[in-house]
């Protein structure tokens, strides 16, 4: 009679993580008597997956009635497959004895597990940057298999080209990770912009995964200042306004200086938002010119988002205004308003 053969018809089997994998194995003879065992890997470090004779293997079930006397089908099903289950599985026939001895092994079936990538996580720079600067964003996704994966970067729907991507590890692995760094040049209009990392993989059924970063968390748009003198409100009062325009984020402190001396400090609270996401704010100072003998240098000094202060000055000509007799006290007011002076 022809010697028993162990037939594993499938060289490879590919399943999705979470599915069950069926590993086929048949023998061509009932002789010699003895059990079948399944192993992952070969050699002394091989891992026992299933033993027909004994043991508890909760994820493994036999496809046919392996306990029947004349059964020659020893195929198994492994449930809830994970990437860690990838490897080559061998169906091995043992000859009954004390102990049982290995008689013949099948050629092996390579199980590959198709696992979805994790949701991409996009992170930006630790510190804010101003327009015209180039900042780096990173995107990471993990746990996918097979290794082939496509990663694209977008800014507001426009594909970016300045990026570098690595898939690790370089060699064979049960699962892989991708890491990509993109360079983005900031513009003043980027407060509402988004940077998107898009990952496409065969397990995603054509629906790429996306990770986003809002440039509002990255950008700092410094304000532009304009100090103007409003028409005289009363004979001896002048209204000076400081327009703080196009800044982001909102964190801003304004100080009025008269001839270098602090007159008033206030924090931007009631601001107006521009369409591009930047803010405008206005502060005003009411100066009683009769309290001044000489010309006054008024300075609007702004500290934005913890950055060094910027300032704009305005020279108030006192000589151009008639003095009110007997008045020698300063009567100054400051205020701020979204749109109107009052």
């Amino acid at each position: 009679e022809e010697e028993l053969q162990v037939i594993q018809p499938d060289k490879s089997v590919s399943v999705a993580a979470g599915e069950s994998a069926i590993l086929h194995c048949t023998v061509t003879s009932l002789i010699p008597v003895g059990p079948i065992q399944w192993f992952r890997g070969a050699g002394p470090a091989r891992e026992l997956i299933y033993n027909q004779k004994e043991g508890h293997f909760p994820r493994v079930t036999t496809v046919s009635e392996s306990t029947k006397r004349e059964n020659m089908d020893f195929s198994i099903s492994i449930s809830n497959i994970t990437p860690a289950d990838a490897g080559t599985y061998y169906c091995v026939k043992f000859r009954k004895g004390s102990p049982d001895t290995e008689f013949k092994s099948g050629a092996g079936t390579e199980l590959s597990v198709r696992a979805k990538p994790s949701a991409p996580v996009v992170s930006g720079p630790a510190a804010r940057a101003t327009p015209q600067h180039t900042v780096s964003f990173t995107c990471e996704s993990h746990g996918f298999s097979p290794r082939d994966i496509t990663l694209k970067w977008f800014k507001n729907g426009n594909e970016l080209s300045d990026f570098q991507t690595n898939v690790d590890p370089v060699g064979e692995s049960v699962s892989y990770s991708i890491h990509s760094t993109a360079k983005v040049v900031l513009t003043r209009e980027d407060v509402h912009s988004q940077v998107i990392c898009e990952v496409a993989h065969v397990t995603l059924q054509g629906d790429p995964l996306r990770g986003t970063a809002n440039l509002s968390e990255t950008i700092r748009v410094p304000p532009t200042l304009e100090v103007t003198q409003q028409p005289v409100r009363a004979e001896n009062q002048v209204n000076v306004t400081c327009q703080v325009r196009k800044f982001y984020p909102q964190r801003l402190q304004l100080t009025w200086l008269e001839n270098g001396n602090v007159s008033r400090t206030e924090t931007a609270s009631t601001v107006t938002e521009n369409k591009d996401g930047t803010y405008n704010w206005m502060s005003w100072l009411l100066v009683n010119v009769s309290a001044h003998r000489d010309d006054v240098k008024l300075t609007c000094q702004v500290e934005h988002d913890g950055q060094p202060a910027v300032s704009k000055s305005h020279d108030l000509k006192v000589s151009a205004h008639p003095k009110e007799q007997g008045s020698n006290t300063a009567a100054e007011n400051t205020g701020s308003n979204e749109r109107n002076i009052y």
């Epitope: 490879s12 590919s14 999705a16 198709r114 097979p146 082939d148 496509t150 993989h201 065969v202 397990t203 995603l204 059924q205 054509g206 629906d207 790429p208």
Partner: antibody
Amino acid sequence: EVQLLESGGGLVQPGGSLRLSCAASGFTLSSYAMSWVRQAPGKGLEWVSISSGSGANTYNADSLKGRFTISRDNSKNTLFLQMNSLRAEDTAVYYCARLRFFDWFDYWGQGALVTVSS
Amino acid sequence: QAVVTQESALTTSPGETVTLTCRSSTGAVTTSNYANWVQEKPDHLFTGLIGGTNNRTPGVPARFSGSLIGDKAALTITGAQTEDEAIYFCALWYSNHWVFGGGTKLTVL
């Protein structure tokens, strides 16, 4: 058992429109990308379009110049192909096929014949 | 657009091993082209045999296997049988679209 059954084929005049359906059974449509592939009489296969599992993303053959639109109703387990501005060269048997992953045409329907002729 | 080329016809005998190939006009076929092999039998009966270069569709006999040989995708039938007589199409993925080859008519005499 996985089954794909196309319907909606027939004779249509040049410039006309037709809507093909593909009724899927034996699996949940939303878990799979689906494709339309056509075969002109005596010719080979030509890929037409893919709909992603959710239906949110579509991929179309450039040669069709936007005349064909793939869509799906996952609640009804049905795939569609809306064909507009039909031409004589669109005459073919149209097959819907399931993609096991995004890279693996595993099951095919029996096809629906579309004839464009005046 | 890329052109995918296959042998127009091949003949083999029962029990023999036969290899069908699939070439891309853009260069070497890689795993990123996700080579597919589809069988067409009379009466327009199509069966997906291989996907993603080397994954056999459940239920397809083990004698069918997919691989990359040199710069081409390949379908190997080990121990061909008379019922394997059919037309075999390969398909390759190019970033956002599939392209099918012209098909190989396999005769098993």
